[in-house]
Interface confidence: low
């Protein structure tokens, strides 16, 4: 018999063999980190001679070369030292930033083993346009430099590397890049476990928190979030068994599907577990059409008796028909409940597809995700309701540029990845749903329907009254503390006598709680400039109340994220190494940033925090104040960097009992607070008939309407004090 | 450019049954769905039902639950609506209109398709 | 079942700022469109989702929505403007359309 020669060692590496040296057999290099095999396989051909795949000569000598980095080809308004071609292992590039722009993202990134940087793209940006700079990763060249609403930029790779993310982003409405961003990586490149865990579980938490964002703890529970029964999730677990998996690694894909819905079923939300093996064929092993796949043991029974000798008559990879099995399911439900249902409307759905190689028969995957994405009407605003989670394990036939367009773009997000072999899977999927320390609610989750009380809007929303009138707001933060202002305090009321109104779904004048605790802070002293001529002090205006009980979380009442903390992080969809200064840098990215506050009749209205050089010119018109500050010769003393200002053109002014309330944003349907309302140039409610009424000030007003709230980012030592227990705080 | 093109004019007896066409074209069909709204002369508009390009499923307006029919062929990008039992009050202008999401309204119109009916 | 109202009819002269109402029980808390709809033509979407313009129609053309009531705003209204506007609004999977509000622009 037929037989290949053994001549076939690589320096510096080792080889496996499939099938030992007879025709048929595949050798497969592999070389010490650090260092990737040239060539990476060999195939042991019927005339008994090896095939290199893509070789030129018939047989080339492998060596186990050495891994780089690429190299930036652009770096917009900046420099980056050292220029080199590209970066050995361990190699490190430095960017700084021109004068008038900031640095976003890693100022240095290194070189890994796997052939990746670590870190994240540096950016040069002076905040100019409706979207943040998009940047240029290592390797890429953009085309497109207006950053305005609906204007695009297009991604390539130089050389030989291979695009992963979107080739083509456009800035939305929102300020958000459409897509993923883009990153060229080298063919032989492949991903770490603890870069996947954190990545595939940050965006799976967001798409958990989505199917119904209420959370409570349960401790028996070992402190796992629950998410209260009301949205649905399919999940659709499609498990490659095609020749070139051994029968160990299927073994290692059905575990690590286990570990997944073992995961998901803790989460206590309403799901269903589609589980599809294929090779040449699908084969349906559990339909989200069957009742059973919602119990958890059926599940795993099913898992556990998927035998890879289902596919032995046919060993191709039809990622297509795999695909297309999970449409007919979905097509079969929709009939089922009806299109236009909500019952269908509102399931998520999320597939996971576990591979070592690309499809080989069966026509284009690409045309069933766009069948899927079809009948799910996926699009800009439904884009929550699908995703595509592809995996490819062992770095051998796995094609980076399929897993990429397979895999969900969505901004900050990953849904591509390689991993080195089925060992790396096994632990990707044992800590990608460690929330175990997020013992908190979910926070900032608004509805955001037409229909939606101003409650249900912002359910962070509270009131804070002495005995008789009402006098300021406040900001849940967490199931028993609300942050304030420090003035609603300064008349040293015995905080006994006073309430703290809670939305209550049960009732339109919402819940009262009793303060367990008041925390003002010890810097607040609204005199303590007056022998400078300054009649009124505001900083450090920030207080914290301990409600003397729980608040049961529900859709009119719940926390609002506060940045710096991990609940914000995983709403914000950020990398797990994220620091206080990075949401700095994502939530004030702009010199004018659109952000709200909640008036006296609960309704949200609509600021720009002035930042930058802004900042400086809307501060400035406090100079013109004579009546509050009569000798004023520096700004600074009053408006000091704790605040942050808005009120210039078409700002809406808060009111004298809207104090404390928060400022917030929206970033990926969540709301984030970075303020608190605390002083201003004028009242719109003076003189006006009721609380649904406010006055714009007169455009000739001196001076102009000037609002001064107190920035989050600016206290966190303070809050860090105080919340120690209660948050979970980010590195600053 | 988008267009939705409809079938020409029809005159039909009452009792019988009429099947206009409109046929999609500069978009992706399968991607928006199509509506179908009348307009009695000189009268205002009213929504006939909705069918989903993709799947083929329908939601009819109340009124017509029993006489109509809205279909698609996929292949050809068309779109059709049947309506039977005809009366002289189904004397209209019939329109086609698609639309992305329901709040995104119908953004472009076919020219219409007038039905007499008539003895 | 639901119901839209609209005013039959509302005249002005060139460049004043027409305001078209149309009714319905909380119409605030959904979604409505506007159209336009000029004789022996189709109509033409110009508001949607309360008061978003699509790509082509003039910025004069504003709409708003609370409480009961939508209102479509032409501000410096041309000759051009003259047609019939209806308002449209889902309800249970169910689109309703207004009764229809003829603007006359008078010479």
């Known amino acids: 018999a037929t037989s290949c020669p053994q001549n076939v060692n690589i320096s510096g590496g080792t080889f496996t063999l499939s099938h030992g040296w007879a025709p048929g057999s595949l050798l497969i290099y592999s070389c010490p980190q650090g260092l990737y095999p040239s060539p990476a396989s060999r195939l042991c051909k019927s005339s008994g001679q090896w095939q290199t795949p893509r070789a030129t000569r018939s047989l080339t000598k492998a060596v186990c070369k050495p891994v780089r980095c690429p190299a930036p080809v652009s770096f917009e308004n900046g420099i980056y030292t050292p220029r080199l071609g590209s970066y050995p292992v361990g190699g490190n590039v430095s960017f700084e930033c021109e004068d008038g722009f900031i640095l976003r993202g890693s100022p240095v990134r290194q070189c890994r083993p796997n052939g990746m940087w670590d870190g994240e793209t540096a950016v040069c940006d002076n905040g100019a346009g409706h979207c943040p700079n998009p940047g240029i990763s290592l390797g890429a060249v953009r085309t497109g430099s207006r950053f305005g609403h609906g204007d695009k930029v297009r991604y390539r790779c130089s050389s030989n590397l291979v695009l992963t993310g979107s080739a083509e982003r456009e800035c939305q409405g929102n300020g958000v890049w459409s897509g993923t961003e883009p990153i060229c990586r080298q063919p032989y490149s492949y991903d770490f476990p603890e870069d996947v865990a954190p990545a595939l579980g940050t965006s799976f938490s967001h798409m958990l928190g989505a199917t119904n964002p209420t959370q409570r703890t349960k401790e028996s529970l070992g402190r796992k979030i629950q998410i209260q029964r009301s949205g649905h999730l399919n999940l659709y677990l499609l498990l490659d068994s095609s020749q070139s998996v051994s029968e160990n690694d299927f073994l290692i894909f059905k575990e690590s599907a286990s570990l997944m819905v073992d995961r998901i079923f803790s989460f206590e939300i309403n799901v269903s577990v589609a589980i599809i093996t294929f090779a040449s064929e699908p084969k349906v092993l559990m339909s989200v059409l069957n009742v059973n796949s919602r119990d958890i043991t059926e599940v795993i029974s099913s898992l556990e008796n998927a035998k890879y000798k289902d596919h032995e008559n046919g060993t191709g990879t039809n990622t297509y028909a795999a695909l297309n099995s999970v449409y007919l399911m979905m097509n079969n439900q929709m009939q089922l409940l009806g299109m236009k249902t909500m019952a269908w409307q509102e399931i998520r759905h999320a597939i996971i597809l576990l591979t070592d190689g690309k499809s080989n028969m069966g026509g284009s995957p690409k045309t069933a995700v766009d069948q899927i994405r079809e009948i799910l009407n996926i699009n800009q605003k439904r884009n929550d309701y699908l995703d595509i989670y592809a995996i490819g394990v062992g770095k051998l036939d796995v094609d980076w540029r399929e897993l990429n367009e397979l895999g969900s773009k969505k901004d900050g997000e990953r849904h591509a990845f390689i991993l080195q072999d089925t060992k790396a899977l096994h632990q990707v999927f044992e800590h990608m749903l460690d929330v175990s320390k997020l013992t908190d609610t979910i926070c900032g989750v608004g509805n955001m329907s037409a229909n939606a009380s101003d409650q249900e809007r912002t359910p962070w929303h509270v009131t804070i009254k002495p005995k008789s009138q009402e006098t300021c707001r406040g900001a849940l933060i967490s199931d028993q503390w609300v942050l304030t202002a420090a003035h609603c305090f300064r008349d040293g009321n015995d905080h006994s006598l006073w309430r703290v109104n809670v939305g209550d779904p049960k009732s339109q004048w919402g819940k009262e709680f009793l303060i367990e605790k008041a925390v003002i802070s010890p810097g607040f002293d609204v005199f303590a400039k007056k022998n400078q001529g300054i009649l009124e002090f505001y900083g450090d205006d920030i207080a914290l109340l301990k409600l003397a009980q729980k608040v049961k979380m529900s859709t009119h009442a719940r926390p609002i994220c506060l940045p710096c903390t991990m609940e914000a992080n995983l709403a914000l969809r950020r990398p797990q190494g994220s620091t206080c200064r990075d949401h700095e840098n994502e939530l004030l990215n702009k010199q004018s940033v659109p952000a709200h506050f909640v008036a006296l009749n609960g309704s949200k209205l609509n600021i720009n925090l002035k930042m930058g050089v802004e900042w400086t010119s809307c501060a400035e018109v406090v100079s013109q104040e004579k009546t509050m500050f009569p000798n004023l010769t520096d700004v600074r003393e009053v408006v000091t960097d704790q605040f942050l200002c808005s009120g210039t053109q078409e700002d809406e002014s808060p009111c004298k009992g809207e104090s404390g309330g928060a400022v917030f944003l929206e970033r990926r349907f969540r709301f984030f607070q970075v303020g608190l309302v605390s002083w201003g140039l004028y009242n719109p409610c003076l003189g006006s008939a009721d609380k649904n009424s406010r006055k714009r000030a007169p455009r000739s007003k001196v001076p102009p309407p000037r609002d001064f709230h107190i920035n989050l980012f600016r206290m966190q030592p303070w809050l860090r004090q105080h919340l120690g227990d209660v948050l979970n705080f980010l590195p600053l | 450019q988008v267009q939705l093109v409809q079938s020409g004019a029809e005159v039909k007896k009452p009792g019988a049954s009429v099947k206009v066409s409109c046929k999609a074209s500069g978009y992706s069909f399968t991607t928006y769905y199509m509506y179908w709204v009348r307009q009695a002369p000189g009268q205002g508009l009213e929504w006939m039902g909705i069918i989903t390009p993709s799947g083929g499923s329908t939601t009819y307006a109340q009124k017509f639950q029993d006489r109509v029919t809205m279909t698609r062929d996929a292949s050809t990008t068309t779109v059709y609506m049947e309506l039977s039992s005809l009366r002289s009050e189904d004397t209209a202008v019939y329109y086609c209109a698609r639309g992305y999401e329901g709040s995104y309204g119908f953004d472009h119109w076919g020219q219409g398709t007038l039905v007499t009916v008539s003895s | 079942s639901y119901e839209l109202t609209q005013p039959p009819s509302v005249s002005l002269s060139p460049g004043q700022t027409a305001s078209i109402t149309c009714s319905g029980d909380?119409?605030?808390?959904?979604?409505t469109c506007w159209y336009q709809q000029k004789p022996g033509q189709s109509p033409v979407l110009v508001i949607y989702?309360?008061?978003k313009r699509p790509s082509g129609i003039p910025e004069r053309f504003s709409g708003s929505n609370s409480g009961n009531t939508a209102t479509l705003t032409i501000s410096g209204t041309q000759a051009m403007d003259e047609a019939d506007y209806y308002c449209q609004t889902w309800d249970s999977s169910t689109a309703v359309f207004g009764g229809g509000t003829k603007l006359t622009v008078l010479g």
């Open positions: 909380k119409l605030g808390n959904k979604y």
């Open positions: 989702q309360d008061n």
